[in-house]
C-alpha cells in the first residue's frame, strides 16, 4: 500500500512557504508588499492592538470551525470596531430602566464610515464583556425595530462564572439592514428570557459598561470595554477590483 | 500552467465506481453483499418507505451541508422512528392544556429498542408537521426536566405558509440523556415565545396530531403524521466490531 | 482524526498534518506584517495508500477504507480538513489596518 | 463555485465536479439495495494548475490564486467540497433496514 516515492520534506516545506507568500498577497489583493517607509516609529497604537486582540480571541458563542468559504470570502476582511454610544447619551432616557433588560445603542454614521456599503459587510458581532455571574441565566437579544417594538434575534444560556468573559452574538443581518436604512441611531436590547409561566424575570448578568458610581480612572477602563460591534468587511477599493497592482487607501 | 497528462475519463469513472463499491460495503461493515434469498416478495412495506422518505427529505431547520465527519460517523447509521405517544394517553392529563403550549411524550422503552446504548446514537430529530399558518410565530422547544420543570432547548421563527411543512429540531443530546436514565416516559413542550412585556402568548401554529374531532379514516392518516423522533444510530453489532465478514441480524 | 494532537505526537507515515511555523521576516523576507511575527501554518502530507482493482479482496481492504479513501475517490489525496483564520496588522502608508485572512492555519487533514 | 450548476453546464478543463450516475444493478451488479435504484455520485476531476517558484511574477498569478490554490498547498489537488448523504433500503435476511450513508454525493469540488 505504499507510494514508493521518497518525499523531500524540505522541498515540500519550501513550496508551501512560497505558496503562502502568494496566498497572503492574493487575499489582500496586493501585487507586492506595502512599503514600510512611512510607518510611524514606536509600538502599534493601543486601539489597533485592542482590535487585533479582539479579532484573535475566540469568544463564547462564536463557532470555532469556519464553514467552507464562498469565493467572496477568500479575500481578506478589514476589521474595525464601533463602540456603543455612552450610557449618558440622551437616547437612553427614552427607554425606562427595567430589571429585565439593558439597552445598547450605536451611531450609524460611525458604522457607515467603517462600512460604506451594506454589501461589503461579511460579518458583524456584538461583543459584550459579562462580569462574574452567580447563577445560570438565559438571556435573549432583541433588535430595536420601530418606535417602541423589538424584534427577537437570538438567545444564550450563560453558565455561572467567577471571571469576566466576552460574549459574542452574530448580528450581521441586522447591521446590514442598518447600513441600508437612513436611521441615525440604532440599538439592541439584552433581556432575561421570560417563560410564559415564570414571573422571576430579572436580568442577573452584569455587563461591563452599565454599572455606575465608579472611581474616575476605573470608569475609563470600564468604558473601553463597553459593548462594541466588531465588523469584518471587504474594503471598498478591494471590492471594486480597481486594485490590480495598486495599494490604494 | 497545464499538467500535460491526458486524462482517461473512462478509467477514472471505472476507478470511482469500484471505489464506491468498497465505500458502501465498508460503511455498512459488510465484506460482501447480503444474500437476497429470504427477502419477502412484493413491494417494500409502507412503514419502511415512509421511513426512507423521512430520511431523504430535507426539512426546515435542518442544515443542508454536513459538517466534516468525525471518524465514527463514517459508518452507516441505521434509521428508525419512534412516534409520539397518542394524545389520549393518561400522561397528557397531568399537563393542563394551555393556549401557549402543546406537549409531546415518548415511550423510552421504544427508544431503547431502537437504540440499546446512548453512545450508539449519532443523531435524533424531533419532526413535527406544521399545518398552514396565517401569521409569523416565534416558538420555543422545552424538555421535561423534573416533576413540573422544563428546560429550554431551542427556538424557531415560523413564517406564514399556506401549505403543511415538516419542522425538524435537533434533540440528540436530550435523547441520549433519556437513554441513560431510567424514566419510562419523557417529553417535550412546544410553546409560544413569551417576551417579558408582551401578554399575547398564544401558540397560533397548528401541529398535526393535536387537532380533534376528525372523521375516523382521516384521524388515522393524521395519526401517522403525528410528531415523531427520527433516530440515526450505529447498530449494536456494527459498533462491537463483531461483524468482520459476518452478516448478523 | 488526523489532527495536530495525533499527528504531532506520532510518526505517522501516511496522510497527516505536519508542523510548519512561518516566521514572516526569516521565511518570507517580510517586515511589513507587524502582528503576528509569524504563525503555525502547518501542511498536509503523506500518501493515502489505496489500491483498487476488480480483483481486490474487499474483505482485506474494507477495514482501511475509513482512513485511506473515505470519499471513494478514484485517486485520493491528502488535503486540509479543518482550517482556521489568521488576523494580521499591517500598514498601508501611514495607516494601520487589521485584517482577517480566512483558512490560513491547517488544524487537521484527510484523504479525499 | 465549482458546483454542479457551473460544472455540468460548462466545458471547464480544470478542477470541476463531473457527472456520474451509479446504477446499482448495471454498474455494480448489485440487486440487494432496494431503494434507491441508483444515485448521482459524481466525482472531482481536473488539474489545479499552479506553479510556484522563487522568481514567479506574483502580479501575474495572484489573480488565479483564489481558484487554483486557495489553501496555498505545496501540491494542490481537486477534491470534494460539499457532500451529501444517501439513505438506502436493504434487507438483512427477512428484515428491512433503512440506513443513512454519509458523504456519498459530491455536489462541488475545490482545489485544496
Amino acid at each position: 500500500l505504499s507510494t514508493c516515492k521518497t518525499i523531500d520534506m524540505e522541498l515540500v516545506k519550501r513550496k508551501r512557504i512560497e505558496a503562502i507568500r502568494g496566498q497572503i498577497l492574493s487575499k489582500l489583493r496586493l501585487a507586492s508588499p506595502p512599503s514600510q517607509g512611512e510607518v510611524p516609529p514606536g509600538p502599534l497604537p493601543e486601539a489597533v492592538l485592542a482590535l487585533y486582540n479582539s479579532t484573535r480571541d475566540r469568544v463564547a458563542g462564536e463557532s470555532a470551525e469556519p464553514e467552507p468559504e464562498p469565493e467572496a470570502d477568500y479575500y481578506a476582511k478589514e476589521v474595525t470596531r464601533v463602540l456603543m454610544v455612552e450610557t449618558h447619551n440622551e437616547i437612553y432616557d427614552k427607554f425606562k430602566q427595567s430589571t429585565h433588560s439593558i439597552y445598547m445603542f450605536f451611531n450609524t454614521s460611525e458604522l457607515r464610515e467603517a462600512v460604506p456599503e451594506p454589501v461589503l459587510l461579511s460579518r458583524a458581532e456584538l461583543r459584550l464583556l459579562r462580569l462574574k455571574l452567580k447563577v445560570e441565566q438565559h438571556v435573549e437579544l432583541y433588535q430595536k425595530y420601530s418606535n417602541n417594538s423589538w424584534r427577537y434575534l437570538s438567545n444564550r444560556l450563560l453558565a455561572p462564572s467567577d471571571s469576566p468573559e466576552w460574549l459574542s452574538f452574530d448580528v450581521t443581518g441586522v447591521v446590514r439592514q442598518w447600513l441600508s436604512r437612513g436611521g441615525e441611531i440604532e440599538g439592541f436590547r439584552l433581556s432575561a428570557h421570560c417563560s410564559c409561566d415564570s414571573r422571576d424575570n430579572t436580568l442577573q448578568v452584569d455587563i461591563n459598561g452599565f454599572t455606575t458610581g465608579r472611581r474616575g480612572d476605573l470608569a475609563t477602563i470600564h468604558g473601553m470595554n463597553r459593548p462594541f460591534l466588531l465588523l469584518m468587511a471587504t474594503p471598498l477599493e478591494r471590492a471594486q477590483h480597481l486594485q490590480s497592482s495598486r495599494h490604494r487607501r | 500552467l497545464s499538467t500535460c497528462k491526458t486524462i482517461d475519463m473512462e478509467l477514472v469513472k471505472r476507478k470511482r465506481i469500484e471505489a464506491i463499491r468498497g465505500q458502501i460495503l465498508s460503511k455498512l461493515r459488510l465484506a460482501s453483499p447480503p444474500s437476497q434469498g429470504e427477502v419477502p416478495p412484493g413491494p417494500l412495506p409502507e412503514a419502511v418507505l415512509a421511513l426512507y422518505n423521512s430520511t431523504r427529505d430535507r426539512v426546515a431547520g435542518e442544515s443542508a451541508e454536513p459538517e466534516p465527519e468525525p471518524e465514527a460517523d463514517y459508518y452507516a447509521k441505521e434509521v428508525t422512528r419512534v412516534l409520539m405517544v397518542e394524545t389520549h394517553n393518561e400522561i397528557y392529563d397531568k399537563f393542563k392544556q394551555s393556549t401557549h403550549s402543546i406537549y409531546m411524550f415518548f415511550n423510552t422503552s421504544e427508544l431503547r429498542e431502537a437504540v440499546p446504548e446512548p453512545v450508539l446514537l449519532s443523531r435524533a430529530e424531533l419532526r413535527l408537521l406544521r399545518l398552514k399558518l396565517k401569521v409569523e410565530q416565534h416558538v420555543e422547544l422545552y424538555q421535561k426536566y423534573s416533576n413540573n420543570s422544563w428546560r429550554y432547548l431551542s427556538n424557531r421563527l415560523l413564517a406564514p405558509s399556506d401549505s403543511p411543512e415538516w419542522l425538524s429540531f435537533d434533540v440528540t443530546g436530550v435523547v441520549r440523556q433519556w437513554l441513560s436514565r431510567g424514566g419510562e416516559i419523557e417529553g417535550f413542550r412546544l410553546s409560544a415565545h413569551c417576551s417579558c412585556d408582551s401578554r399575547d402568548n398564544t401558540l397560533q401554529v397548528d401541529i398535526n396530531g393535536f387537532t380533534t374531532g376528525r372523521r375516523g379514516d382521516l384521524a388515522t392518516i393524521h395519526g401517522m403524521n403525528r410528531p415523531f423522533l427520527l433516530l440515526m444510530a450505529t447498530p449494536l453489532e456494527r459498533a462491537q466490531h463483531l461483524q468482520s465478514s459476518r452478516h448478523r441480524r | 482524526a488526523l489532527d495536530t494532537n495525533y499527528c504531532f505526537s506520532s510518526t505517522e507515515k501516511n496522510c497527516c498534518v505536519r508542523q510548519l511555523y512561518i516566521d514572516f521576516r526569516k521565511d518570507l523576507g517580510w517586515k511589513w506584517i507587524h502582528e503576528p511575527k509569524g504563525y503555525h501554518a502547518n501542511f498536509c502530507l503523506g500518501p493515502c495508500p489505496y489500491i483498487w482493482s476488480l480483483d481486490t479482496q474487499y474483505s482485506k481492504v474494507l477495514a482501511l477504507y475509513n482512513q485511506h479513501n473515505p470519499g471513494a475517490s478514484a485517486a485520493p489525496c491528502c488535503v486540509p480538513q479543518a482550517l482556521e483564520p489568521l488576523p494580521i496588522v499591517y500598514y498601508v502608508g501611514r495607516k494601520p489596518k487589521v485584517e482577517q485572512l480566512s483558512n490560513m492555519i491547517v488544524r487537521s487533514c484527510k484523504c479525499s | 463555485a465549482l458546483d454542479t450548476n457551473y460544472c455540468f453546464s460548462s466545458t471547464e478543463k480544470n478542477c470541476c465536479v463531473r457527472q456520474l450516475y451509479i446504477d446499482f444493478r448495471k454498474d455494480l451488479g448489485w440487486k440487494w439495495i432496494h431503494e434507491p435504484k441508483g444515485y448521482h455520485a459524481n466525482f472531482c476531476l481536473g488539474p489545479c494548475p499552479y506553479i510556484w517558484s522563487l522568481d514567479t511574477q506574483y502580479s501575474k498569478v495572484l489573480a488565479l490564486y483564489n481558484q487554483h490554490n486557495p489553501g496555498a498547498s505545496a501540491a494542490p489537488c481537486c477534491v470534494p467540497q460539499a457532500l451529501e448523504p444517501l439513505p438506502i433500503v436493504y434487507y438483512v435476511g427477512r428484515k428491512p433496514k433503512v440506513e443513512q450513508l454519509s458523504n456519498m454525493i459530491v455536489r462541488s469540488c475545490k482545489c485544496s
Epitope: P33, Q36, R246, H247, R248 | - | G93 | -
Partner: antibody
C-alpha cells in the same frame, strides 16, 4: 487614462519663488499621495517631499524643509509645489509623481523646467 | 539615508543584445526596489516594482531580480525603443532615494 499634467517652464531670478502645478485626472485624487522629485541637468533624481490630498498631511526631505511648500486643491484635483529663495543650483526639471503604497511612483508628470538665472 | 549605487553609468549595446544593469543599496531594502525608464522630453515610466514585478504594459523582455542589497535589471533582447536612461529607486525607507542612472546608447 491616468494622467498628471504639469504647468509650463519658468525662468526665475535668484531669491524669487516659483509655483509649479500638477493636474491629476483618471483616478480618485484623494486616494493617492502626490510626491515631488527634481532632476538637475545631467544629474540623478532627487526626492523633495509628499502631500496627502485626503488629510493635507505633508512630509519634506530635510534639504527642502522651510523652503518648499506643498499644497493641494481637491476641487480641481491639482497639486502645487512652491519653492522659495531660489538659487542657481535649483535649476532643474521638477516632476510630480503619484505614489503607490507598494513603494514606487507609478505615474509621472511630464516635468517642468525651472531655470534660475540672474 | 540609503545610498543607491548604479552601474554602469553608461553602456553601449546593439539591437538584440542581452543587457544587465545593477543597483546596490547601502543596506538591506527587503526587495523594495523599482526600475524606471526615462527618455528625453517624455514622462518617466515605471518598468518594474518590488524587484521583479512587471508593470502593466511593459514588454516581457524586461525582468528584474535580486534580494537584500543587490538587484539587477535585465533586457533579454534589446529593441530600438529601449535606448534610454534607466534609474533604480528604493521604496523601503524615507527619504526615497534613486541611483545615479545608466545611459543605454546604441553601439
Amino acid at each position: 487614462e491616468v494622467q498628471l499634467v504639469q504647468s509650463g517652464a519658468e525662468v526665475k531670478k535668484p531669491g524669487a519663488s516659483v509655483k509649479v502645478s500638477c493636474k491629476a485626472s483618471g483616478y480618485t485624487f484623494t486616494s493617492y499621495d502626490m510626491h515631488w522629485v527634481r532632476q538637475a541637468p545631467g544629474q540623478g533624481l532627487e526626492w523633495m517631499g509628499r502631500i496627502d490630498p485626503q488629510s493635507g498631511g505633508i512630509r519634506y526631505a530635510q534639504k527642502f524643509q522651510g523652503r518648499a511648500t506643498l499644497t493641494v486643491d481637491t476641487s480641481t484635483s491639482t497639486a502645487y509645489m512652491e519653492l522659495s529663495r531660489l538659487r542657481s543650483d535649483d535649476t532643474a526639471v521638477y516632476y510630480c509623481a503619484r505614489w503607490d503604497y507598494g513603494g514606487y511612483f507609478d505615474v509621472w508628470g511630464q516635468g517642468t523646467l525651472v531655470t534660475v538665472s540672474s | 539615508d540609503i545610498q543607491m549605487t548604479q552601474s554602469p553609468s553608461s553602456l553601449s549595446a546593439s539591437v538584440g543584445d542581452r543587457v544587465t544593469i545593477t543597483c546596490r543599496a547601502s543596506q538591506d531594502i527587503y526587495s523594495y526596489l523599482n526600475w524606471y525608464q526615462q527618455k528625453p522630453g517624455k514622462a518617466v515610466k515605471l518598468l518594474i516594482y518590488y524587484t521583479s514585478n512587471l508593470e502593466t504594459g511593459v514588454p516581457s523582455r524586461f525582468s528584474g531580480s535580486g534580494s537584500g542589497t543587490d538587484y539587477t535589471l535585465t533586457i533579454s533582447s534589446l529593441q530600438p525603443e529601449d535606448f534610454a536612461t534607466y534609474f533604480c529607486q528604493q521604496g523601503d525607507t524615507l527619504p526615497w532615494t534613486f541611483g545615479q542612472g545608466t545611459k543605454l546608447e546604441i553601439k
